[in-house]
């Protein structure tokens, strides 16, 4: 997260880290005791999933292996349309005050809505600085029409933009797949942005979760 702040401890109990060995690979969101929602471009053969801590590599955090993941069938590596994936944990999460599932959206929030995005991604760009603490940024949803003025053909129909005018605050490498939460519901998954990160007036781009609720529910049901 560029130009963010340290999240209030325990305020994101649904936030997970997808690790490759001991290294951060992506963020993710707990949606069920067996399931984590993340970005399709985060796909690996297997995952170590850290839950229940704001510190990356916390020895006291829950760590669960995951060997199965289900990308949206319409995902494109080139355009990043349908950049959403479900990761099935090999064993169920132990729920607690530190580990909770996020609330999936009942509706799509409108432009102007205040939201918070979080992650352990680099806080500087192009030179990288990875924080140990979970970082947050407060952003507002931007209309598709406004966002298309910036990104034109790069912006797909189920992509959601968020940012703050003239501000550098944004997501960056390592934040991918993490949550954009608005009014206590998951509205976005970190998908992409421009590089180097933190270009003013280049919104962060997210997968618009409200458009995928049916796919999420059906996929979890199919692979119970």
């Amino acid at each position: 997260i560029i130009d963010g702040y340290k999240c209030k401890e325990g305020s994101h109990p649904w936030q997970v880290a997808l690790l490759k060995g001991n290294q951060l690979h992506c963020g993710g969101v707990l949606v069920d005791k067996y399931w984590v929602l993340t970005a399709a471009h985060c796909k690996m053969g297997q995952y170590q999933v850290q839950l229940g801590s704001d510190k990356i590599g916390d020895q006291s955090a829950q760590k669960i292996k995951a060997t199965k993941s289900f990308r949206h069938p319409g995902y494109s590596t080139k355009t990043h349309v349908n950049d959403i994936m479900l990761v099935r944990l090999d064993e169920p999460v132990k729920m607690s005050s530190k580990v909770e599932a996020v609330q999936l959206p009942e509706h799509c929030e409108p432009p102007g809505t205040s939201c918070t995005v979080s992650g352990w991604g680099t806080t500087t760009s192009p030179d990288v600085t990875f924080p140990s603490d979970l970082m947050c940024s407060d952003v507002k949803l931007i209309s598709s029409r406004e966002c298309k003025k910036v990104y034109k053909d790069l912006l797909g129909k189920t992509m959601l933009c968020a940012g703050i005018p003239d501000s550098k605050t944004n997501t960056c490498n390592g934040d991918s797949g993490g949550p954009l939460v608005c009014n206590d519901t998951l509205q976005g998954l970190v998908s992409w942005g421009t590089y180097p990160c933190g270009q003013p007036n280049d919104p962060g781009v997210y997968t618009q979760v409200c458009k995928y609720k049916r796919w999420v529910m059906e996929t979890m049901k199919t692979h119970r």
Partner: antibody, heavy 122, light 107 residues
């Protein structure tokens, strides 16, 4: 279809400033996510990245050339330019302008100009 | 700067042969690795992006693999029109850097 075209003098005298312009057609230089680069290739050699400019005017230069390079953009003309000062014979090369899709997820040069040979000689 | 070491610098193969080029990065670049083809007197052309993704319109005989520091580019069945110099390029960190190139010739 995006097209890039380099223009400028093919011969520059030592110690002078090399100036090239790249004209972009079929796409807007103001589009977010696309950066505009200069790359050069010495005769019979490999590719050397010089630097880029973004729609906002944000630039980044190769540290090895930084003290001599200036890249600027003119969005109204859909052009960007390279200036390389205090040139020597070692700056003789084919100069390419290129567009890069530059996102957190992937970044690559997808469109290139045809290149222009600049010879530094008195 | 990240150094990109490409090998071999040149190779000669017969039409129909499988050709393999390797590229090694001086540090971990994840999958931010692209491959370009350059024919004499022409600009480079993107073939593979993100280490393994084939650019639209590029023949499927071209492929790429690898992650981290070690990458491979393969032409499964060399064709006469593949005579060119091939370059790898890292896009993980600035400044972007290229390998030294591999000149592919027909025996």
């Amino acid at each position: 279809q995006v097209q890039l075209q380099e223009s400028g003098p093919g011969l520059v005298k030592p110690s002078q400033t090399l100036s090239l312009t790249c004209t972009v057609s079929g796409g807007s230089i103001s589009s977010g996510g696309y950066y505009w680069h200069w790359i050069r290739q010495h005769p019979g050699k490999g590719l050397e990245w010089i630097g880029y400019i973004y729609r906002s005017g944000y630039t980044y230069y190769n540290p090895s050339l930084k003290s001599r390079v200036t890249i600027s953009v003119d969005t109204s003309k859909n052009q960007f330019s390279l200036k390389l000062s205090s040139v020597t014979a070692a700056d003789t090369a084919v100069y390419y302008c290129a567009r890069a899709k530059q996102l957190t997820t992937h970044r690559y040069f997808d469109y290139w100009g045809q290149g222009t040979l600049v010879t530094v000689s008195s | 700067d990240i150094q990109m070491t490409q090998s071999p610098s040149s190779l000669s193969a017969s039409v129909g042969d499988r050709v393999t080029i390797t590229c090694q990065a001086s540090q971990d670049i994840a999958n931010y690795l692209n491959w370009y083809q350059q024919k004499p007197g022409k600009a480079p052309k993107l073939l593979i992006y993100d280490a393994s993704n084939l650019e639209t319109g590029v023949p499927s005989r071209f492929s790429g693999s690898g992650s981290g520091t070690d990458f491979t580019f393969t032409i499964s069945s060399l064709q006469p029109e593949d005579i060119a110099t091939y370059y790898c390029q890292q896009a993980s960190d600035l400044p972007f850097t290229f390998g030294g190139g591999t000149k592919v010739e027909i025996k």
